[in-house]
């Protein structure tokens, strides 16, 4: 029963991870800069993220362009796209994975097939959250060095925006639940043999006449 | 400090080839974004294309794409341009000048530092 | 392609006065607007971006406003040194169009 409670919490918070990467890729929420007009009044703030820039005004209009051309973009984006959808891809495969081996379902019937299930669905959503760390840890490094770097002016020096903390959070939460999905997996227990202690191995009676312990009175 | 240095003036014969250099330094040149316009003699500013050293990747205004191309040494840290079959329309003062922004596309193309110019003149 | 338009060819205007040169976008350009000053035999250099923001060093008698479609760049007191050409340009989206200029003079 802790085990099936285990289950659950694992798939809730591996779903809630899921959702958390989708819009923190989605989002163009990566990267921010505010440019300051006349009279130190922030003008324009401009947010980057995988898909799409756009820019916001102090009036609160706000435009997007996606980006038109795959090549103009660096490479390092490029892999960040990449990889987001890759975790999204193996999250989703992660989960229909834990669904077909959870306890409280019938899609599988041997209790041990269920556990392997489960264990390689926890991999699966342990990985997913590493490839959605990869992209967002990289693009922090990158905001950092670049915030320190002389040679960079300062009034292109961005702010990590919200989609990075959201992609934190949402890889912790894909690596919580694939962990918890991992723990529910029981230990592999060692086979009592039925007969005395001996040697060599007996054959199966049942399968050799085709009766079984029950017809023994 | 940022310095954009372009090569010599160019007097070519009509038909004729050039190959300009700009060569970059203060700075990260695979950073930036490096652009080319045109002015010709009296006249406004024309924007030729850019160049994003990284990667190589380029694009061009339409009207002048059949006549130019442009390179990236980053070795050297260079950008080059080449203006091919010289009519006396290409005589004109070319620039190379650095994308300010790093945003990676789209709104940012305002234009920081500029070259001093390299002159061509067309003439038979 | 978006064409940018500076209606004024030429302005004539004196040492200390408040000057403000127009530009005006064919389309929407979301404040991605830009203004650079050319002195003869000189290469542009840039004043302002995003409509409004200063460049580095750029003398706080520069300020620049608008949105959508019109844009102005105001030199609030104008010095012996301001008297140039001006061009704007979008910064919204390539090919980068400049407007033809206009060039600041002595009245």
């Known amino acids: 029963m802790a085990s099936t409670g285990l289950e659950l919490l694992g798939m809730t918070l591996a779903v809630l991870g899921w959702l958390g990467t989708l819009v923190s890729c989605a989002l163009p929420l990566w990267k921010v800069t505010a440019f300051i007009g006349n009279s130190i009044v922030v003008a324009q703030v401009v947010w980057e993220g995988l898909w799409m820039s756009c820019v916001v005004q102090s009036t609160g209009q706000m435009q997007c362009k996606v980006y038109d051309s795959l090549l103009a973009l660096p490479q390092d984006l490029q892999a960040a796209r990449a990889l987001c959808v890759i975790a999204l891809l193996l999250a989703l495969l992660g989960l229909l994975v834990a669904i077909t081996g959870a306890q409280c379902t019938t899609c599988v019937e041997d209790e041990g097939a269920k556990a392997r299930i489960v264990l390689t669905a926890g991999v699966i959503l342990l990985l997913a959250g590493i490839l959605v760390l990869i992209p967002v840890c990289w693009t922090a490094h990158a905001i950092i060095q670049d915030f320190y770097n002389p040679l960079v002016a300062e009034a292109l020096k961005r702010e990590l925006g919200a989609s990075l903390y959201l992609g934190w959070a949402a890889a912790a939460l894909l690596m919580l639940g694939g962990g918890l999905l991992c723990c529910t997996c029981p230990p592999p227990q060692v086979e009592r043999p039925r007969g005395p202690r001996l040697g060599y191995s007996i054959p199966s009676r049942s399968g050799a006449s085709g009766l079984d312990k029950r017809d023994y009175v | 400090q940022v310095q954009l240095q372009q090569s010599a003036p160019e007097l070519a014969r009509p038909g004729a080839s050039v190959r300009m250099s700009c060569k970059a330094s203060g700075y990260t040149f695979t950073t930036y974004t490096m652009h080319w316009v045109k002015q010709r003699p009296g006249q406004g500013l024309e924007w030729i294309g850019f160049?994003?050293?990284?990667?190589?990747?380029?694009e061009y205004n339409q009207n002048l794409k059949d006549k130019t191309t442009l390179t990236a040494d980053k070795a050297s840290s260079t950008a080059y341009m080449q203006l091919t079959s010289l009519t006396s329309e290409d005589s004109a003062v070319y620039y190379c000048a650095r994308q300010f922004s790093l945003i990676t596309t789209g709104f940012g193309y305002a234009l920081d530092y500029w070259g001093q110019g390299t002159s061509v003149t067309v003439s038979s | 392609d978006i064409v940018m338009t500076q209606s004024r060819k030429f302005m004539s205007t004196s040492v200390g006065d408040r000057v403000s040169i127009t530009c005006k976008a064919s389309q929407d350009v979301s404040t991605a607007v830009a203004w650079y000053q050319q002195k003869p035999g000189q290469s542009p250099k840039l004043l302002l971006y995003w409509a409004s923001t200063r460049h580095t060093g750029v003398p706080d008698r520069f300020t620049g406003s608008g949105s959508g479609t019109d844009y102005t760049l105001t030199i609030s007191s104008v010095q012996a040194e301001d008297l140039a050409l001006y061009y704007c340009q979008q910064h919204y989206s390539t090919p980068l169009t400049f407007g033809a200029g206009t060039k600041l003079e002595l009245k």
């Open positions: 160049i994003i050293p990284s990667s190589g990747y380029t």
